[in-house]
Interface confidence: low
Amino acid sequence: SQVSQNCHNGSYEISVLMMGNSAFAEPLKNLEDAVNEGLEIVRGRLQNAGLNVTVNATFMYSDGLIHNSGDCRSSTCEGLDLLRKISNAQRMGCVLIGPSCTYSTFQMYLDTELSYPMISAGSFGLSCDYKETLTRLMSPARKLMYFLVNFWKTNDLPFKTYSWSTSYVYKNGTETEDCFWYLNALEASVSYFSHELGFKVVLRQDKEFQDILMDHNRKSNVIIMCGGPEFLYKLKGDRAVAEDIVIILVDLFNDQYFEDNVTAPDYMKNVLVLTLSPGNSLLNSSFSRNLSPTKRDFALAYLNGILLFGHMLKIFLENGENITTPKFAHAFRNLTFEGYDGPVTLDDWGDVDSTMVLLYTSVDTKKYKVLLTYDTHVNKTYPVDMSPTFTWKNSKLPNDITGRGPQGGGGSENLYFQ
């Protein structure tokens, strides 16, 4: 049956998929609040532009009877069920916001006509790359890969004088949705990251990771993992670590490192944290007051999805163009719009660009400090601290190949029991 779009005659509707399975376990009420806050802003912006139109959102809930795992495991079918619900209602908005799970987005993209845009807070996996009508408002795995390759190759900074070509990747299969797809991309033999590295091994057991920390026969000094400090501590504890080990902790959606009173714990001294540059504080907004940092990013992506739609609607209406055309569906890319927290840039494929920040722990102040930033839009690294107070010898990052630099030694101090 033909689905009509409620998207003309001065009335424009946004279809928001409220899926029980999502990339982050966020109460749907909080996402509704984010969407509603976005709608208020969009209405104000359109009114200021002299456009007297109505913009609303329809929240489409899945039944939650079959697909109720709460994470992304059973999301493929849930997405299709919601599409079926839209089809049965024969009613669709101008744009589809959600889903956030890679599986469901991929499947929904395959099973939908390309006549309307899809905006996702998530869909991190490589399988959602280069989709003509899909926009992703949280950093996808491709962006992470490009940073890592860029950083590995860098050898002309005062604190990094070696190019790296090797890595271990710790991936035990219990990661959060974002981490799962980030590490999946690094693991994939066909990915850019794998192509650019000479050696890469995935560590799947806690013991494998723990053994590498002091293994004199290790093939790389660099270990990539994904999660927060708590995750690392429970894995690494207070174990001794060879002095040329560098752990890259990918923790993009966590702005707690930038809070004033945060002291970096001892176990973080061998760690470089990759996170996103924090935006302006969202704590005063009604939708985010009670959200954790990760969830602020997730809710913010929903809100920014609404603002993006408003931005495109305004442009098309001012130009007298039809909203229900493939041109509109394909337009949500290669642009910058005013997001809730500042300008948001989308690349040629509709993926959000951002400033990634690499942090280190200062041995002097025990604070997290910015080592460098990386602009995903131009694929360029900008050093910030030219004289970092590293734990590593000579305040330089070591070579990635064991045996070419100083080696650690001594006994292991286990967190739990000696």
Partner: antibody
Framework: EVQLVESGGGLVQPGGSLRLSCAAS????????MHWVRQAPGKGLEWIGE????????NVHEKFKDRFTISVDKAKNSAYLQMNSLRAEDTAVYYC???????????????WGQGTLVTVSS | DIQLTQSPSSLSASVGDRVTITCRAS??????????MQWYQQKPGKAPKLLIY???KLASGVPSRFSGSGSGTDFTLTISSLQPEDFATYYC????????FGQGTKLEIK
């Protein structure tokens, strides 16, 4: 309301087994570490072990490793303590508690269940 | 394990008294500028209740007459002016390496 409720205690013979449950409500279960702590009659508190619901990581004190296993059912927001080869000295009130790690790395047991009594006797 | 020794094991005091309980760890529980030491209150037949975390930080909802101090291996819980509801057993706990508790201090009415 944040709440932990233990169940499954009772009288068991030496050498027997028992499975204790801890039902969590009022908070995001997967964001915590869930712990089991016991207290023998008239004695102090003794930590048994912990589990991270979202990842299934467990750490059990060496003293209990061979006999006690900790597990979770995320769908039910519940943690479990499986106790095998029980001895008279395992007679105690068993508490379920949680930790939430702060950015600064503090760990503390901020919420406790009411406890469930396990009596091992013939 | 890190061993914790509380003193005294028991203590008699009156309402309005200032009371101090100490806890000594077998090794330092300091961790990058923080001391991972907690204090709990337990009444008969009830679960323990968190009073102090990170040596000196007052847990939510705990009266300000309770305070904690110390660093490294030596820690103190102080009740500035005893109230009738404060008579209970108090435990220290470290979370520096795994989790261990002191043997407890029973605070009784004189």
């Amino acid at each position: 309301e944040v709440q932990l409720v233990e169940s499954g205690g009772g009288l068991v013979q030496p050498g027997g087994s028992l499975r204790l449950s801890c039902a969590a409500s009022g908070f995001t279960f997967s964001h915590t570490w869930m712990h089991w702590v016991r207290q023998a009659p008239g004695k102090g508190l003794e930590w048994i072990g912990e589990i991270k619901p979202s990842r299934g990581f467990t750490n059990v004190h060496e003293k209990f490793k061979d006999r006690f296993t900790i597990s979770v059912d995320k769908a039910k927001n519940s943690a479990y303590l499986q106790m095998n080869s029980l001895r008279a000295e395992d007679t105690a009130v068993y508490y379920c508690t949680r930790t939430i790690t702060t950015t600064q790395g503090y760990w503390f047991f901020d919420v406790w269940g009411q406890g469930t009594l396990v009596t091992v006797s013939s | 394990d890190i061993q914790l020794t509380q003193s005294p094991s028991s203590l008699s005091a009156s309402v309005g008294d200032r009371v101090t309980i100490t806890c000594r760890a077998s090794e330092s529980v300091n961790w990058y500028g923080s001391s991972l030491m907690q204090w709990y209150q337990q009444k008969p037949g009830k679960a323990p209740k968190l009073l102090i975390y990170a040596a000196s930080k007052l847990a939510s909802g705990v009266p300000s007459r309770f305070s904690g101090s110390g660093s490294g291996t030596d820690f103190t819980l102080t009740i500035s002016s005893l109230q009738p509801e404060d008579f209970a057993t108090y435990y220290c706990q470290q979370t520096r390496k795994a989790y261990t508790f002191g043997q407890g201090t029973k605070l009784e009415i004189k």
